[in-house]
């Protein structure tokens, strides 16, 4: 079951697995969810009683029954992790910890004006974990308003120590925060020659990349196939590092394939959770249990719903033995891989999905797109809503996108002449106006976030935000749609969509089905010469036919330019202005969500 | 073992410009400051500046600023200080001294290795 | 700027007797202090830092004290390698300061 609240006072006996240092109770409850088999955890607090070198420790603990017994300690502070628990879990943590030490390897000092400058350059380096900045009242002068950079092997610090006038903090990676480039491909027949920090078994590639992206010292990976040579080799997962953060040497070997950890895209791309199925596949391990399973489906889902078991292995049942029930093996290992992958053997193996809780929900696929045709189908795109204004009759306004359970991304031009939020409603999960009756259920809005450097649409910051009154609950029909990766500020997208409900030519009135329009991006550089009386600048983004013929139009304000990339859709633009609809050598204008992300991140997660 | 070695006494003319090295060994040359004091004959000594070689930012007494710069080489472990348009009072002796480790948190320290210093003449 | 002023300007003492060279500060320096010695022809050497710490390798003849505004460095029997000037330098705020200097010669 699923306990959040922590338990003051409190030791948990015995069942230790390791020890690390938190700076607080909470970070260390984000620890032990991250950890492949800690559930239950005891953090020692700083405390007059206690043992100042016992302070800040984080003990990660496992137990067969998911519970030991409890000791009653003055600043002990125990609880469960989230491993047990439904809702999405993130390691973001922008906390400061004040008078704080966090001890790592100092590996980079500068001068920084404050700690959220010092965090940003934490944040940049793809080394650092952690840092500590020394304020303007630290009592040695030369260390006023240095930056110290730190790692670790665990990414959490060695020891946590009191000093005064310094403040301490984490990078904010994990909060998808990071300007460091994200590259998302993996090189074939590749050997990255590099000092190995870890080695795990792994089936394919691409989980050797996603293990290597939530290893906190890996920067890139080999991996070895199952027809590798070397025997002893195959199926192993060398996670790397470098003191420049990119491989020294790369060797062409068959067989090997490499890349790079997914950390500046994490928020974009599923890193935790391995959903495939690996067929004629064993996975080893410490054996759970064993129970009888109609299918390597129904395997998962019990391997999924016992908190313990982090991967299994599927023996499909022979002829008509046990009512056509296989069996299935539950599994788990130190680090939450299999010792060893065999094959040829008839098994079908797989990882629990509990970790997927982990991973951004916008990174789910969906349906799969329905080719040609102009108006959509129910699913298609779960991210679009409509908003309606209710005054001075009730009509819809503008379009939206999902990027929260309680958010929604927009164009701020929308809300012109829009006094109160009281006057909106957002429906989600509609694909025809004509559904939308009486009693359709909606969100109401509690507030408008606009761009509080937004004049008109042309002159640029075209965006707001929607916080919802309630939270969106997440299904095939609706669901949110991710934010492009800072560090994907390269990326060229070919896999562009405009969808809404609005005009289909400029003298029109609101389609009832929702429409969608493939478009291709146009540079700014072109789209300039297409708008010599307006400056387009780096914080829009235009798309449209030479032609013409296709784009947005009067009603699909607001809405989502959504492009697929590496089977992940990402809102990469906000329908903005432009002159007339689909004419000729007029692309449309769309916000440049990217440029944007920022913003997004400080207003949608403000305390 | 630690040392700063510096280059080799010079003769100036009023206006002239002097720039003075100290090459650093023994220790990682990035992770400690470096001050430049110097001392004018039968004088006490007088802070010039300081300057940080892992980002080269640096600071100077208000004394000479403009007139002086610090700057660093990291390939040869080297700090540089170029003192321009020189008169006769800025005959002396110019040391560097190394200063703060800046890879730790402490609250005190001082300069505990120096240069063997630099005489500059300055004359018509 | 803070002014580091230093007394007496020359010390005479026997060897073997004790020596108490004054530091004062025009504001409060807290423990930012350094002391170090400087013989004739030759560069300065560190002795005491953070007004009390003695630095690597010196004896434990030398000893300092005080902090805020008013220091002292005490050198508990003068060997004949101690005859020398020695500076106070405050390291609490920028420009760095040293004091005029204590001769101490022998008596």
């Known amino acids: 079951e699923c306990v959040t609240q922590l338990l003051k006072d409190t030791c948990f006996e015995g069942g230790d697995i390791t020890t690390v240092f938190t700076p607080s109770a909470k970070y260390c409850q984000v620890v032990c969810t991250y950890h492949p088999r800690c559930l239950l955890f005891t953090f020692t607090a700083e405390s007059p009683s206690e043992d100042p070198t016992r302070w800040f420790t984080c003990v990660l603990k496992d137990s067969v029954t998911e519970t030991l017994p409890r000791v009653n300690r003055t600043a002990a502070i125990s609880g469960y992790s989230f491993k047990q628990c439904s809702h999405q879990i993130s390691a973001c943590n922008k906390d400061i910890y004040v008078d704080l030490d966090m001890k790592g390897i100092n590996y980079n000092s500068s001068v920084a004006k404050s700690a959220q400058e010092c965090q940003e350059r934490c944040t940049d380096d793809v080394h650092c974990h952690f840092f500590t900045y020394a304020t303007r009242q630290f009592p040695s002068l030369e260390h006023r308003n240095i930056c110290l950079l730190k790692h670790t092997q665990t990414g959490t610090p060695t020891r946590i120590t009191k000093l005064d006038k310094v403040v301490s903090g984490f990078s904010l990676k994990s909060c998808a925060l990071s300007n460091l480039a994200c590259i998302r491909d993996i090189f074939p027949n590749t050997v990255f020659a590099d000092s190995n920090i870890d080695s795990v078994m792994a089936p394919d590639a691409f989980v050797c990349g996603r293990i290597c992206t939530h290893h906190p010292g890996c920067l890139f990976f080999t991996f070895f196939s199952q027809e590798w040579p070397k025997e002893s080799q195959r199926n192993l997962c060398l996670l790397k590092t470098s003191e420049s953060g990119l491989p020294s040497t790369r060797i062409k070997k068959s067989k090997a394939l490499s890349g790079f950890s997914l950390q500046s895209c994490r928020h974009s791309i599923p890193v935790f959770c391995h959903s495939s199925f690996y067929h004629d596949t064993d996975f080893l391990g410490e054996e759970l249990d064993i129970v009888a399973a109609k299918s390597h489906e129904a395997c998962q889902k019990l391997c999924t719903n016992a908190v313990r078991c982090q991967f299994f292995t599927y023996t499909p049942a022979q002829a008509s033995c046990n009512e056509g029930k296989g069996k299935c093996y539950l599994k788990l290992s130190s680090n939450g891989s299999p010792t060893k992958i065999l094959h040829g053997r008839g098994g079908i193996s797989g990882y629990t999905l509990r970790l997927c809780k982990m991973d951004n929900e916008c990174t789910t696929k969906i349906k799969p797109r329905i080719v040609g045709g102009t108006a959509s189908v129910r699913g298609e795109w779960p991210w679009q809503v409509t908003l309606h204004t209710t005054s001075p009759t009730q009509r819809h306004l503008c379009g939206g996108s999902i990027i929260g359970n309680q958010w929604i991304l927009t164009a701020a031009h929308c809300f012109y002449g829009v006094e109160s939020p009281k006057i909106l409603r957002v429906y989600s999960g509609i694909l025809n106006q004509s559904e939308i009756k009486e009693d359709t259920s909606f969100f109401g809005v509690q507030e408008i976030i606009i761009h509080d450097q937004y004049k008109m649409a042309e002159s640029g910051y075209d965006i707001a935000l929607l916080k919802l009154e309630t939270t969106v609950n997440y299904t095939d029909s609706q669901r949110p749609i991710c934010l492009p990766s800072k560090g994907d500020r390269n990326v060229i997208y070919t896999d562009c969509w405009v969808t809404g409900w609005g005009y289909r030519k400029l003298r029109d009135k609101i389609q009832n089905t929702l429409q969608k329009a493939k478009i291709p991006l146009v540079t700014n550089e072109e789209c300039q010469k297409r708008y010599r009386g307006h400056k387009i600048t780096h914080k829009m983004i235009c798309a449209g036919y030479r032609e013409g013929g296709k784009d947005a139009c009067k009603g699909d304000s607001g809405g989502p330019l959504s492009c697929k990339h590496n089977e992940v859709w990402h809102l990469v633009g906000i329908t903005s202005w432009g002159e007339g609809c689909a004419q000729r050598e007029r692309p449309g204008v769309y916000t440049n969500v990217v440029e944007y992300v920022d913003w997004i991140l400080e207003k949608t997660q403000a305390v | 073992q630690v040392q700063l070695v510096q280059s080799g006494a010079e003769v100036k003319k009023p206006g002239a410009s002097v720039k003075v090295s100290c090459k650093a060994s023994?220790?990682?040359?990035?992770?400690?400051?470096m001050h430049w004091v110097r001392q004018a004959p039968g004088q006490g000594l007088e802070w010039m500046g300081i300057i940080n070689p892992s980002g080269g930012s640096t600071s100077y007494a208000q004394k000479f600023q403009g007139r002086v710069t610090m700057t660093r080489d990291t390939s040869t472990s080297t700090v540089y200080m170029e003192l321009s348009s020189l008169r006769s009072e800025d005959t002396a002796v110019y040391y560097c001294?190394?200063?703060?480790?800046?890879?730790?948190?402490?609250?005190?320290?001082?300069?505990?290795?120096w240069g063997q210093g630099t005489t500059v003449t300055v004359s018509s | 700027e803070i002014v580091m002023t230093q007394s007496p300007a020359t010390l005479s003492v026997s060897p073997g007797e004790r020596a108490t060279l004054s530091c004062r500060a025009s504001q409060s320096v807290s423990s930012n202090l350094a002391w170090y010695q400087q013989k004739p022809g030759q560069a300065p050497r560190l002795l005491i830092y953070g007004a009390s710490t003695r630095a690597t390798g010196i004896p434990a003849r030398f000893s300092g004290s005080g902090s805020g505004t008013e220091f002292t460095l005490t050198i508990s029997s003068l060997q004949s390698e101690d005859f020398a000037v020695y500076y106070c330098q405050q390291f609490n705020d920028w420009p760095l300061t040293f004091g005029g200097g204590t001769k101490v010669e022998i008596k």
């Open positions: 023994g220790y990682t040359f990035t992770s400690y400051s």
């Open positions: 001294a190394r200063g703060a480790y800046l890879l730790e948190l402490y609250y005190y320290y001082g300069m505990d290795v």
